[in-house]
Interface confidence: low
C-alpha cells in the first residue's frame, strides 16, 4: 500500500565516470521497522515469480549480513527514516534507475530514481543577471549540479584566462531536495569588461581541470570618448580653423546622439562627429568637449582648452 | 597573531622530490590564499604558487610540470613539493599568505634548502 | 612573465639623508578592475620579507611615513625621506597584475 511509504530524494542524481553519487533520502514506513532492504539497477518486475529481477548493487538481509558489493554501495540509512545512499566510485554504466526495495514486516514498497552518469565530467553552468552596467556590482553565479563527499571539487573563476581575484563563496546542497555544488563571484564590471570571456572552472581536489563553462560580458556603458583637436596644441590666432573630433571607443549599446559643448553648454546645431571652427574669434576660446549618449545615458570626453591669441 | 613555520628537509639529492610543508597559527587556511616563494642565492625570488581558500591551486607555468601544492585542513597545513630538483633549486623556502588583493602580509621565517649530491 | 627591473643595485645613504629607488615593469601593472597591484618588500638581515606598500602608495600598518610609494603603468618609485639606521636591507618590488606574480631584482640599502 504506496500511502503506507512516504519518500523524499532528488528526482534525478548526475555524476560522471570514477566520480561518486551520495544520496540523501528518507522514507517513512508507518507499519514498523525496516526489516530487508535491496539496491536494484533497472529493476523490472517478473509477473510470474511476483518478484523484481535486475542487478542488485546492494542487499541488506533481514539477519544483516552484507554483500561484498558494500564496499562500493553503501546504505548509509536506518531501519525508520533515513535511506542514503552512497556509491563511489559511481560508473557510466550505473546510469540508469535506482530501484530501493524496502521490506517492513507486512508491507513491500520499491522506489525509483534516476541516475544520469556522463562519460566526462559536464559543464556547471554560469549564470549571470539580466543585464549589467559598468561599476555596478553584481553577482556572477556558477552552479554544477553534482556534489558528493568523496569526491571533492571546486569551481574556479577566470577573466581572460586568468584567476579572478574577488573572493568566490563556495557553497554545496546535499539534501533531500537539492544537490548541487554553487560559487558566487560578487563583481564590480568597468566598461574594459565589455566582451571579455569569463570562464568557471570546474577542477578536482589536486586543482586539475574538468570541466568548464564560459561567457561573454556583455557590459551596458555610456559611449567611451576620444576628442581630438587640429592644431593639436589647441593654440590659434584669430581667424584660424580649427577641427575637433570626437572618436567614440566604446558604447554599449550602439550611441543615439552627439552634441559639442563649450564651457559646459551645448552648442546649438553641432550634432555631429566633427566640429569644424573657421575663422575663429577671441570669444571662442574656452573649454571644449564631446558629448554622445546611448540608453545607459550621456558619456562626455576630456575637456579640450581652446586659446586663441590675437592675430 | 598569525604564523607561518615552514619545514623541511635541509640537503636534498639531485633527481629527488623536495617536500615542504608550512604550518599556520593564528589564522584557518580556509580563508585567504596560501603562497610559496623562493629566493636564490644573490636575492632573486620566485613566485611558485598558491592553494586558496577553497582548495584551488595556481601555479607559475615555469613549474608547472614539477610543482605541487596540497592542503590539510585539520591539521592547518600547507604542503608544496618540487619533483626532479637540480641545484638550480637550491634556495630560501617561503610559505606566504596572500589575505586579499592587495598583496602577502604574511610570511614565514624561510627554510633554506640546499640540492647537492 | 612580466619582468620588474629595479634600479640602483645597490644604494649607500647616510643616515638622514633621502634616498629613492626606481622599478620599472615591462608591461602595464594597470588591472582591469581599476587597480595597479604595485607593492614594495623589505628584507632586513636575517629576517623575512616585509610588506613596507601595497597598490602603488598605500603603507601597511606600522609602516613609518618617511616611505612613500609612487608612479603608475610601467614606472614606479619608492622613496625613503630621512633613512634610518633601521632601514637597511633588500628591497624589492613586485606585482601582482599578471600571472605569474614576479619579483624585481632587488635594491640593497647600506648605511654610509
Known amino acids: 500500500d504506496s500511502s503506507k511509504w512516504v519518500f523524499e530524494h532528488p528526482e534525478t542524481l548526475y555524476a560522471w565516470e570514477g566520480a561518486c553519487v551520495w544520496i540523501p533520502c528518507t522514507y517513512r514506513a508507518l507499519d514498523g521497522d525496516l526489516e530487508s532492504f535491496i539496491l536494484f539497477h533497472n529493476p523490472e518486475y517478473n509477473k510470474n515469480t511476483s518478484k523484481f529481477d535486475g542487478t542488485r548493487l546492494y542487499e541488506s538481509t533481514k539477519d544483516g549480513k552484507v554483500p561484498s558489493e558494500q564496499k562500493r554501495v553503501q546504505f548509509l540509512g536506518d531501519k525508520n527514516k533515513n535511506c542514503t545512499l552512497s556509491i563511489h566510485p559511481v560508473h557510466l554504466n550505473d546510469s540508469g534507475q535506482l530501484g530501493l526495495r524496502m521490506e517492513s514486516k507486512t508491507e513491500k514498497w520499491m522506489e525509483r530514481i534516476h541516475l544520469n552518469v556522463s562519460e566526462r565530467p559536464f559543464p556547471p553552468h554560469i549564470q549571470l543577471p539580466p543585464e549589467i552596467q559598468e561599476s555596478q556590482e553584481v553577482t556572477l553565479t556558477c552552479l554544477l549540479n553534482f556534489s558528493c563527499y568523496g569526491y571533492p571539487i571546486q569551481l574556479q573563476w577566470l577573466l581572460e584566462g586568468v584567476p579572478m581575484r574577488q573572493a568566490a563563496v563556495t557553497s554545496t546542497s546535499l539534501t533531500i531536495k537539492s544537490v548541487f555544488t554553487r560559487s558566487e563571484l560578487k563583481f564590480s564590471p568597468q566598461w574594459s569588461h565589455h566582451g571579455k570571456i569569463v570562464t568557471c572552472q570546474l577542477q578536482d581536489a589536486d586543482g586539475k581541470f574538468l570541466s568548464n563553462d564560459t561567457v561573454q560580458l556583455n557590459v551596458k556603458h555610456t559611449p567611451k570618448l576620444e576628442i581630438k583637436v587640429t592644431p593639436s596644441d589647441a593654440i590659434v590666432r584669430e581667424g584660424d580653423s580649427v577641427t575637433m573630433t570626437c572618436e567614440v571607443s566604446s558604447s554599449n549599446p550602439e550611441y543615439t546622439t552627439v552634441s559639442w559643448l563649450k564651457d559646459g553648454t551645448s552648442l546649438k546645431k553641432q550634432n555631429t562627429f566633427t566640429l569644424n571652427l573657421r575663422e575663429v574669434t577671441k570669444d571662442q576660446s574656452g573649454k571644449y568637449c564631446c558629448q554622445v549618449s546611448n540608453d545607459v545615458g550621456p558619456g562626455r570626453s576630456e575637456e579640450v582648452f581652446l586659446q586663441v591669441q590675437y592675430a | 597573531e598569525v604564523q607561518l613555520q615552514e619545514s623541511g628537509p635541509s640537503l636534498v639529492k639531485p633527481s629527488q622530490t623536495l617536500s615542504l610543508t608550512c604550518s599556520v597559527t593564528g589564522d584557518s587556511i580556509t580563508s585567504g590564499y596560501w603562497n610559496w616563494i623562493r629566493k636564490f642565492p644573490g636575492n632573486k625570488l620566485e613566485y611558485m604558487g598558491y592553494i586558496s581558500y577553497s582548495g584551488s591551486t595556481y601555479y607559475n607555468p615555469s613549474l608547472k610540470s614539477r610543482i605541487s601544492i596540497t592542503r590539510d585542513t585539520s591539521k592547518n597545513q600547507y604542503y608544496m613539493q618540487l619533483k626532479s630538483v637540480t641545484t638550480e633549486d637550491t634556495a630560501t623556502y617561503y610559505c606566504a599568505r596572500y589575505p586579499s588583493p592587495d598583496a602577502m602580509n604574511y610570511w614565514g621565517q624561510g627554510t633554506s634548502v640546499t640540492v647537492s649530491s | 612573465d612580466v619582468v620588474m627591473t629595479q634600479t640602483p643595485l645597490t644604494l649607500s645613504v647616510t643616515i638622514g639623508q633621502p634616498a629613492s629607488i626606481s622599478c620599472k615593469s615591462s608591461?602595464?601593472?594597470?588591472?582591469?578592475?581599476?587597480?595597479?597591484?604595485l607593492n614594495w618588500l623589505l628584507q632586513r638581515p636575517g629576517q623575512s620579507p616585509k610588506r613596507l606598500i601595497y597598490l602603488v602608495s598605500k603603507l601597511d600598518s606600522g609602516v613609518p611615513d618617511r616611505f612613500t610609494g609612487s608612479g603608475s603603468g610601467t614606472d614606479f618609485t619608492l622613496k625613503i625621506s630621512r633613512v634610518e639606521a633601521e632601514d637597511l636591507g633588500v628591497y624589492y618590488c613586485?606585482?601582482?597584475?599578471?600571472?605569474?606574480?614576479?619579483f624585481g631584482g632587488g635594491t640593497k640599502l647600506e648605511i654610509k
Open positions: 608591461q602595464s601593472l594597470l588591472d582591469s578592475d581599476g587597480k595597479t597591484y
Open positions: 613586485w606585482q601582482g597584475t599578471h600571472f605569474p606574480w614576479t
